[in-house]
C-alpha cells in the first residue's frame, strides 16, 4: 500500500511530492540502472538523510532528525529505484532534498521539493452568547493558512473575522459569523489549497413549530445531496440547547450503524435512517421540551447543520385545570 | 565529531616544493574519496586532484598534471598532496573534502569529479603562497 503522497513534475529533474503531516512518504528517484550503485539523500544539501554503499546502509552520519524514519526500496534498486521511504514526515521537514547516485557509469542528481499539509477535519459550531447566535467554523489544526469563505443564501458574504493563533506546526482558526435573528441559511467553506481539500458547514433554520403538551412533534433531518455521500462515514447527532448548552439526544454511526438513544421519548424511524432520513420524533412533550433542536450530520468532508425550534404550549385541559 | 585538518601550507619561492597534509577522523575514512581544492582571491574554488578510496585512482586538473601527486595512507586516515615546481599562479588557500566513493571523485563521470556537492565534509584551509 502506497502512503498518500501525489507528485508533480516539473523540469529539471525536479519533483514536488505533497504529503500529510504525520503520515508517510515517498520521495521518487530513479537512474539507468549499473552496477556499484552509490546513494545519498541530502536535505537542503547539507543534512544527511540516507547513504547506501556496498550493498547495505551506512547510517552511521545520519542526521539524528532522520533516525529510524527512512529506508529504501532495496529489492528495487538494482531496477534502477532510489526513492526514499519516508516515515512521519513533519513540517520541519518541508524542503529540498536531493538524490546523489552513483554507478559505476555516471552520477546523477535528482531533487525533490517537498511540501507539508495539515487539514484536521474542521467543525461547524452554533453557540448562543447572551442573546446573540453564532455560527462559528473552526479548523484546530491547519497548514498553510487555509481559505476561509462564508456564504448567506448561496451569496458570498464579504464579513470573514478570522481568530488565529499559531503555533510551530500550524494554525487553529475560527471564524464567527453573527447570525442573531437571521433565518437565512449559512454555508462556510474551508480549503487547504496545498492538500486540495476542501470542508463545507452548512446551517439551515427550520421554521418554528408550535406543539401542545402531550402531543408528539416530528423533526426533519435529511442530508444536502451537493454533500452528502453514503458510502463515506459519517455521524449524525441530535441535541437539545438547554440554557445555552447542548445535551445529546441521540447518535448514529454509519460505520456500525449503531443507534445510541439518551431520551426515552425519543424515536428514530430505522427505515428512514436506510434513505438517508434522520428526521427524529418526540413524544408525550412537556413544557420543558420548548427550545432548539441541533441535527448535525458531519463527515470528514462537510458538517450539514439543522435547526429546529419547537415552542410547547398547555394545553387546554391542563390551562383550565390551573 | 568529523574533522578534516589541512596542513603544511606556508611561503615558497617559485620551482620549490610543499607537502600538504589532511588528516581525517569521525568517519568511515575506507568508504571516502578525497579531493584537493583551491580558491586564490577573487575566482571560484576549483578541484585539482582527487582520490578514490575502493579504486585507488587518482585524478589531477591539466593545470597541476606532472607536478602534484595525491596520495593516501588509509591507516593513519591521511591524504596528502605533494606539490613540486610550484608556480605563483599556485598561490591560494588549499582545501582537503571527502565525499562518498562512487560519488565524489568518480573514474568515469570527470563532470562530477569535483562537484562540491558531492562533498560531505571540508577542512578549513591551508594558505599557499608563492613568490617568484
Known amino acids: 500500500i502506497f502512503p498518500l503522497a501525489f507528485f508533480i513534475y516539473v523540469p529539471m529533474n525536479e519533483q514536488i511530492v505533497i504529503g500529510r503531516l504525520d503520515e508517510d512518504i515517498i520521495l521518487p528517484s530513479s537512474f539507468e540502472r549499473g552496477s556499484e550503485v552509490v546513494i545519498h539523500w541530502k536535505y537542503q544539501d547539507s543534512y544527511k538523510v540516507h547513504s547506501y554503499y556496498k550493498g547495505s546502509d551506512h547510517l552511521e552520519s545520519q542526521d539524528p532528525r532522520y533516525a529510524n524514519r527512512t529506508s529504501l526500496f532495496y529489492n528495487e534498486i538494482q531496477n534502477g529505484n532510489a526513492s526514499l521511504f519516508f516515515r512521519r514526515v513533519s513540517l520541519l521537514d518541508e524542503g529540498i532534498y536531493t538524490c546523489y547516485v552513483g554507478t559505476a557509469i555516471q552520477v546523477i542528481t535528482n531533487k525533490v521539493v517537498l511540501k507539508v499539509g495539515v487539514f484536521l477535519t474542521p467543525v461547524m459550531k452554533y453557540e448562543k452568547r447572551n442573546t446573540n447566535s453564532f455560527l462559528i467554523c473552526s479548523v484546530l489544526s491547519v497548514y498553510p493558512r487555509p481559505i476561509i469563505t462564508w456564504k448567506m443564501d448561496n451569496t458570498p458574504i464579504s464579513e470573514n473575522n478570522m481568530e488565529e493563533t499559531g503555533s510551530l506546526d500550524s494554525f487553529s482558526i475560527n471564524s464567527p459569523l453573527n447570525i442573531t435573528g437571521s433565518n437565512s441559511s449559512y454555508e462556510c467553506t474551508i480549503e487547504n489549497s496545498l492538500l486540495k481539500q476542501t470542508w463545507t458547514g452548512r446551517w439551515t433554520m427550520k421554521d418554528g413549530l408550535h406543539k401542545m403538551q402531550s402531543e408528539h412533534v416530528s423533526l426533519s433531518c435529511q442530508p444536502v445531496n451537493d454533500y452528502f455521500s453514503p458510502n463515506q462515514d459519517f455521524k449524525v447527532t441530535w441535541s437539545r440547547m438547554k440554557s445555552g448548552t447542548f445535551s445529546v439526544l441521540a447518535y448514529y454511526l454509519s460505520s456500525s450503524q449503531n443507534t445510541i438513544i439518551n431520551e426515552s421519548r425519543f424515536s428514530w424511524n430505522k427505515e428512514l435512517i436506510n434513505q438517508s432520513d434522520f428526521s427524529m420524533n418526540l413524544m408525550d412533550l412537556n413544557l420543558s421540551d420548548s427550545g432548539e433542536y441541533l441535527c448535525n450530520i458531519s463527515s470528514d468532508e462537510y458538517t450539514l447543520l439543522t435547526i429546529h425550534t419547537v415552542h410547547v404550549e398547555p394545553s387546554q385541559e391542563t390551562a383550565s385545570h390551573n | 565529531d568529523v574533522q578534516l585538518q589541512e596542513s603544511g601550507g606556508g611561503l615558497v619561492q617559485a620551482g620549490g616544493s610543499l607537502r600538504l597534509s589532511c588528516a581525517a577522523s569521525g568517519f568511515p575514512f575506507d568508504d571516502y574519496s578525497i579531493g584537493w581544492f583551491r580558491q586564490a582571491p577573487g575566482k571560484a574554488r576549483e578541484g585539482i586532484s582527487c582520490i578514490s578510496s575502493t579504486h585507488g585512482t587518482t585524478y589531477y586538473t591539466d593545470s597541476v598534471k606532472d607536478r602534484f601527486t595525491i596520495t593516501r595512507d588509509n591507516a593513519k586516515n591521511t591524504v596528502y598532496l605533494q606539490m613540486n615546481n610550484l608556480k605563483p599562479e599556485d598561490a591560494a588557500v588549499y582545501y582537503c573534502?571527502?565525499?562518498?566513493?562512487?560519488?565524489?571523485?568518480?573514474?568515469?563521470?570527470?563532470?562530477?569529479?569535483?562537484?562540491?556537492?558531492?562533498?560531505?565534509?571540508w577542512g578549513q584551509g591551508t594558505q599557499v603562497t608563492v613568490s617568484s
Open positions: 573534502a571527502a565525499g562518498l566513493d562512487g560519488l565524489a571523485c568518480h573514474r568515469r563521470d570527470s563532470g562530477s569529479r569535483y562537484r562540491t556537492q558531492l562533498y560531505d565534509y
